[in-house]
């Protein structure tokens, strides 16, 4: 039931950043800061913001929005012991 | 009884690489996010990262790059490569179920 | 996030009443705040989580309050098994977790 909810917010997610230009989005995140400063996953590298390419643009945004979700679960898990948020690994490779 | 085990602690050369195990006994740690500590001698503690159980692993901004966080559920185990070392990597190295669990920790010394 | 405890050293008497703070830089992700014992050549101890909220096992001498960017531990009355150093730690969704700089109790 999770896993669904997580895919429609991603698709919602999704949807939201489509209807932003480019370069809106872009001034958005800047203005914004959005990402932190965080690292990610084995080849998950965050790119520099001033890609101007939407893709790109989308991609980054995107994997540090995933980030900071996986992020906040951890923190709730083990610093709020909230263990209904904790990822399991079941189905996930 | 329910412990963490770190080792592959020693003395390494600035610039070499180590890979430290953390090796569970008495519980699975599969289901369990997976935490690296550090704590510099005489010094307070330091967040490296965490690695989740599905294997995706992050890490504080000073140890991207350098420290990667893997995990093998079959050995119940979870690693951390460190590469590129310096001096002031020098420490002993936690690895801790969640944070209510922690090893006993293994002493890396930095120096050539 | 920087987490800031003060004093970094408290010289105390066994059953005194003793409070340390941890004030956070920006406010605590969630207020998940916790707090943590370390004793020399020991690894750290959790004690609280979520600022307030008692670990299984942790004498009820030990409480947590605070919320946003001030937190306090207190022991109600402090015990010989009570000397130690303790760490704050707090959520953040930049940096993951961030820990205070320690306060060591000692024996006056």
């Known amino acids: 039931r999770r896993d669904v909810a997580h895919g429609i917010l991603n698709e919602a997610y999704r949807k939201v950043l489509d209807q932003l230009s480019a370069g809106k989005h872009l001034q958005s995140l800047v203005a914004r800061g959005v990402g932190g400063s965080l690292g990610g996953g084995a080849g998950d590298d965050a790119e520099p913001l001033s890609k101007r390419h939407s893709d790109g643009i989308f991609t980054d945004s995107y994997s540090r929005y995933r980030k900071q979700m996986a992020v906040k679960k951890y923190l709730a898990a083990v610093l709020g012991k909230r263990y209904k948020q904790r990822v399991k690994n079941k189905g996930r490779r | 009884e329910v412990q963490l085990v770190e080792s592959g602690g020693g003395l390494v050369q600035p610039g070499g690489s180590l890979r430290l195990s953390c090796a569970a006994s008495?519980?699975?740690?599969?289901?369990?996010?997976m935490t690296w500590v550090r704590q510099a001698p005489g010094k307070g503690l330091e967040w490296i990262g965490f690695?989740?159980?599905?294997?995706?692993?992050y890490y504080a901004s000073w140890a991207k790059g350098r420290f990667t966080i893997s995990r093998d559920n079959s050995k119940n185990t979870v690693y951390l490569q460190m590469n590129s070392l310096r001096a002031e990597d020098t420490a002993v190295y936690f690895c801790a179920r969640d944070l209510d669990l922690w090893g006993q920790g293994t002493l890396v010394t930095v120096s050539s | 996030q920087v987490l800031t405890q003060s004093p970094s050293t408290l010289s105390a008497s066994v059953g005194d009443r003793v409070t340390i703070t941890c004030q956070s830089s920006?406010?605590?992700?969630?207020?998940?705040l916790a707090w943590f014992q370390q004793k020399p050549g020991k690894a750290p101890k959790f004690l609280i989580y979520e600022a307030s909220k008692l670990e299984s096992g942790v004498p009820s001498r030990f409480s947590g309050s605070g919320s946003g960017t001030e937190f306090t531990l207190t022991i109600s009355s402090l015990q010989p098994d009570d000397f130690a150093t303790y760490y704050c730690?707090?959520?953040?969704?930049?940096?993951?977790?961030?820990f205070g700089g320690g306060t060591k109790v000692e024996i006056k």
């Open positions: 008495g519980i699975d740690l599969n289901s369990y996010y």
């Open positions: 690695i989740d159980a599905g294997g995706d692993a």
């Open positions: 920006e406010s605590v992700y969630g207020n998940y």
């Open positions: 730690a707090g959520g953040d969704i930049s940096e993951g977790v961030a």
